[in-house]
Each structure stands twice: as structure tokens, then as C-alpha cells.
């Protein structure tokens, strides 16, 4: 594979986060080559001596893949020719967190870039009116979070108000003994107001809004990954 080790190509990565138990993407792009057979992609992880993934001559080459990634990785083979070296990681584990290197060799030269990959659990909260409660109460539930998040309530009418005295948050460990279900209850809510339940850890921030009027209830949820451009 005759490349002069002196030429460098541009490789770009994006920090991202993976949701435990789901599939994740480690993003990497590079200056494309005209021949697929001239492109080599190697993914490495700090502290792991075997390869995370290797793609060469148009196909996966997994003979040197480290055990911890066996059967869990794939590149987007049809997109390699246009410079996409992103790695799909199946069934993300907590231990997949760390620094990865995307290393590319083409006929033009070689290049690499590192990316930080965080792992945890995050999910959309759903806010509902708790009709079983003795007073007007809102219940905010999110099924999977890790690490343990903070929960803060806010209201459109009482902006800047501190609801910690009139709310109660609990965390219930899920069956796989890693992630937790988040339940937060807000008491003494008033009608014709919009309340927000904000759940946040160092990986993600999620908000569940509920607008309660005499005639209707409107809900909206939003989730944003932190420290990530993905």
C-alpha cells in the first residue's frame, strides 16, 4: 500500500453521546478518494489494544478487532466513497465511553482525528395532570436516565420561582441495574399556566412542558445532547 507517510489528509470528527442499550454513531468524515479499494478506515479506542473496527478494500476486516466490540460495529459502506467514515455502534454500553481515534489512509495520504464519546441514558419526559392527587398536581416521568440527573420545575407565570419546596423527585432503578426511572411531582399548580419539568445530567437536557387551561391540556417535549454538535 504505497503511500508516502508524509502526506496528510483532513479528517473531521464530532463529539457525541450514546444512549445505553441503543445504537450510537461515532461521526467521522474525510477527504474522499476516487477508488474505494484505496481507502482504509481504522477506528481505535484509548486504552483498548485491539482495533474497534477496520474497513479496507471495500469491506470490513475484523481479524484484529478487540473482543469488547465484536459483532457491534459497522461503517456505512456505501458512503465511504464520499468521505463518510462514521461508525455505527450497536447496543451501546456504559464502558464504550472514552476517546476514539478515526484513522484514515487513502491514495492521497493519511490523517486522523480524535473524538470524545460519552455514554449514559436519556429519555423524553412526559408531564401529566395527576387526577388521583388531593390537590392540583403535575407528574413528570422519564423512563431511562444515567447518571442520576437533576430535576427542576419552572413556570411561565411565576418566572424565576423556586419550586423545590413544592415538588418531590424520586429515582427508581430499572431492571438492568444501571439506568433509572425519574418521577417528579409538582404540587399546588394553578390553572392557565405553562409548567416545565427540566431533567439534566452531564450528557443530556430534556424538557417536558404542559399547558393547563380550563378547556384543554397541551404537552410538548424536547431533548438536547450537551457538549455535542451532533
Amino acid at each position: 500500500f504505497g503511500i508516502s507517510g508524509r502526506h496528510s489528509i483532513t479528517v473531521t470528527t464530532v463529539a457525541s453521546a450514546g444512549n445505553i442499550g441503543e445504537d450510537g454513531i461515532l461521526s467521522c468524515t474525510f477527504e474522499p478518494d476516487i477508488k474505494l479499494s484505496d481507502i482504509v478506515i481504522q477506528w481505535l479506542k484509548e486504552g483498548v489494544l485491539g482495533l474497534v473496527h477496520e474497513f479496507k478494500e471495500g469491506k470490513d476486516e475484523l481479524s484484529e478487532q478487540d473482543e469488547m466490540f465484536r459483532g457491534r460495529t459497522a461503517v456505512f459502506a456505501d458512503q465511504v466513497i464520499v468521505g463518510n467514515a462514521s461508525l455505527r455502534l450497536k447496543n451501546v454500553q456504559l464502558t464504550d465511553a472514552g476517546t476514539y481515534k478515526c484513522y484514515i489512509i487513502t491514495s492521497k495520504g493519511k490523517g486522523n482525528a480524535n473524538l470524545e464519546y460519552k455514554t449514559g441514558a436519556f429519555s423524553m419526559p412526559e408531564v401529566n395532570v395527576d387526577y388521583n392527587a388531593s390537590s392540583e398536581t403535575l407528574r413528570c416521568e422519564a423512563p431511562r436516565w444515567f447518571p442520576q440527573p437533576t430535576v427542576v420545575w419552572a413556570s411561565q407565570v411565576d418566572q424565576g420561582a423556586n419550586f423545590s419546596e413544592v415538588s418531590n423527585t424520586s429515582f427508581e432503578l430499572n431492571s438492568e441495574n444501571v439506568t433509572m426511572k425519574v418521577v417528579s411531582v409538582l404540587y399546588n399548580v394553578t390553572i392557565n399556566n405553562t409548567y416545565s419539568c427540566m431533567i439534566e445530567n452531564d450528557i443530556a437536557k430534556a424538557t417536558g412542558d404542559i399547558k393547563v387551561t380550563e378547556s384543554e391540556i397541551k404537552r410538548r417535549s424536547h431533548l438536547q445532547l450537551l457538549n455535542s454538535k451532533a
Partner: antibody, heavy 121, light 107 residues
Framework: EVQLLESGGGLVQPGGSLRLSCAAS????????MHWVRQAPGKGLEWVSA????????YYADSVKGRFTISRDISKNTLYLQMNSLRAEDTAVYYC??????????????WGQGTTVTVSS | DIQMTQSPSSLSASVGDRVTITCRAS??????LAWYQQKPGKAPKLLIY???NLPTGVPSRFSGSGSGTDFTLTISSLQPEDFATYYC?????????FGGGTKVEIK
């Protein structure tokens, strides 16, 4: 100063056991993968075993697999090689070495002075 | 396992000579190659990593080249302290392997 210091070598009978130690100092031990490399008298270098920085992954040459066990104690900054069922062909100077680079793709940049293992009846 | 074949196994040279040692891998190892120098009774010393890079403190008369399967260690002007045995080593595979060594002797 970055340093590796091996100990534990000696004379042992065939079938016997030895435990080699390698005390590390001057660097953050748990961020570097470590190797054991041996050199039989008058011969070249032979890789024996490796362990990842966390200790979670271990690797062995076919010639020692099932007989040798590599481990590390991060609290003591020490690397170990437990050698069982020793054979005459295990006679060598054993070196511990630190892996350069965060991703395992580079060479071994720091070596100990070596400890001699002699297997003979 | 990946076989690493060094040539020559020994050579005689004089101070000031340009010396070239080659190493061939049995399969593509890209640039996952290191070179070491070893003197009698001493531990090996890293000379080159990633096929072409010199660690801090290694004199610039040492250089490495190559990628894929064919690699070269060059000493541009041999010095008295360079008489030693030189080894190549691959780290592409997690069954690390060394070449058989090249002994550089005084002519």
C-alpha cells in the same frame, strides 16, 4: 524520572512457578498499556504478554497461553507476570515495557532492566 | 501471527558510513512499526515509532521510512555508540511480533 524495575526472577525446576513483578514510577500507571517481553540467551526479542491500562484486556503469545497470567495492581503501580508449568524454553531475561501512545498503535518507549528466569533441573 | 523478517542479520560498517536495515512484514501493517536498538546486557531502546517518528532524545541521524509491508531504518552517519543490534516490531496485531534482529558490527 520514568522508571520500571523488575524483580522475582530466579532458578526454578521444570513444572515450577514464579511470579515476576515490575514496579512503575514517574508516570500515571493506569493510563498506559504494559507488556512483558523476553529474550532467551543469545536470541532475539519475543513478546510474551500485554495488558490494557485498566487491566480489563489481556493478551498472550501462543507459547505461554494457559500457563502465564498478566495482571496489574493500580494501587501499587505494579505489573505482574505469574508463570506456571515452567519449561526449559522459558529460560530468558524478562523485561517489562510501557506502551507509547494512547491507542496502542506505537512502540514500547520505557523498558525495565530485566530479570533473569532460569528453568533447569 | 504476522512474521517480521529483517535483513541483513548482521553487517559490518565503519564510523561515518550510511547504514540501511530493512524489515518486511508478512502482511500489511500500515505504519504500525517500531525500531529498537539493543546493546549487550542492556534493555532495548525505542528509536522509531509509527514507522517514521523519532522519540525525544533520539539523534536525528536515525530515520525510518516505509508503510504497508516494507520498512527501512537508516543511520545516516554511523557513530561509535551505534554498534548494537537493531529490531523491528509490529503493533498492528495484538499478537505483537519482533524481527529477528540485525547486528551492526565494526568493520
Amino acid at each position: 524520572e520514568v522508571q520500571l524495575l523488575e524483580s522475582g526472577g530466579g532458578l526454578v525446576q521444570p513444572g515450577g512457578s514464579l511470579r515476576l513483578s515490575c514496579a512503575a514510577s514517574g508516570f500515571t500507571f493506569n493510563t498506559h498499556a504494559m507488556h512483558w517481553v523476553r529474550q532467551a540467551p543469545g536470541k532475539g526479542l519475543e513478546w510474551v504478554s500485554a495488558i490494557s491500562g485498566s487491566g480489563g484486556s489481556t493478551y498472550y503469545a501462543d507459547s505461554v497461553k494457559g500457563r502465564f497470567t498478566i495482571s496489574r495492581d493500580i494501587s501499587k503501580n505494579t505489573l505482574y507476570l505469574q508463570m506456571n508449568s515452567l519449561r526449559a524454553e522459558d529460560t530468558a531475561v524478562y523485561y517489562c515495557a510501557r506502551l507509547l501512545g494512547r491507542f496502542g498503535e506505537y512502540g514500547m518507549d520505557v523498558w525495565g532492566q530485566g530479570t533473569t528466569v532460569t528453568v533447569s533441573s | 501471527d504476522i512474521q517480521m523478517t529483517q535483513s541483513p542479520s548482521s553487517l559490518s560498517a565503519s564510523v561515518g558510513d550510511r547504514v540501511t536495515i530493512t524489515c518486511r512484514a508478512s502482511q500489511n501493517i500500515y505504519t504500525w512499526l517500531a525500531w529498537y536498538q539493543q546493546k549487550p546486557g542492556k534493555a532495548p531502546k525505542l528509536l522509531i515509532y509509527d514507522a517514521t517518528n523519532l522519540p525525544t532524545g533520539v539523534p536525528s541521524r536515525f530515520s525510518g521510512s516505509g508503510s504497508g509491508t516494507d520498512f527501512t531504518l537508516t543511520i545516516s552517519s554511523l557513530q561509535p555508540e551505534d554498534f548494537a543490534t537493531y529490531y523491528c516490531q509490529q503493533s498492528y496485531s495484538t499478537r505483537w511480533t519482533f524481527g529477528g534482529g540485525t547486528k551492526v558490527e565494526i568493520k
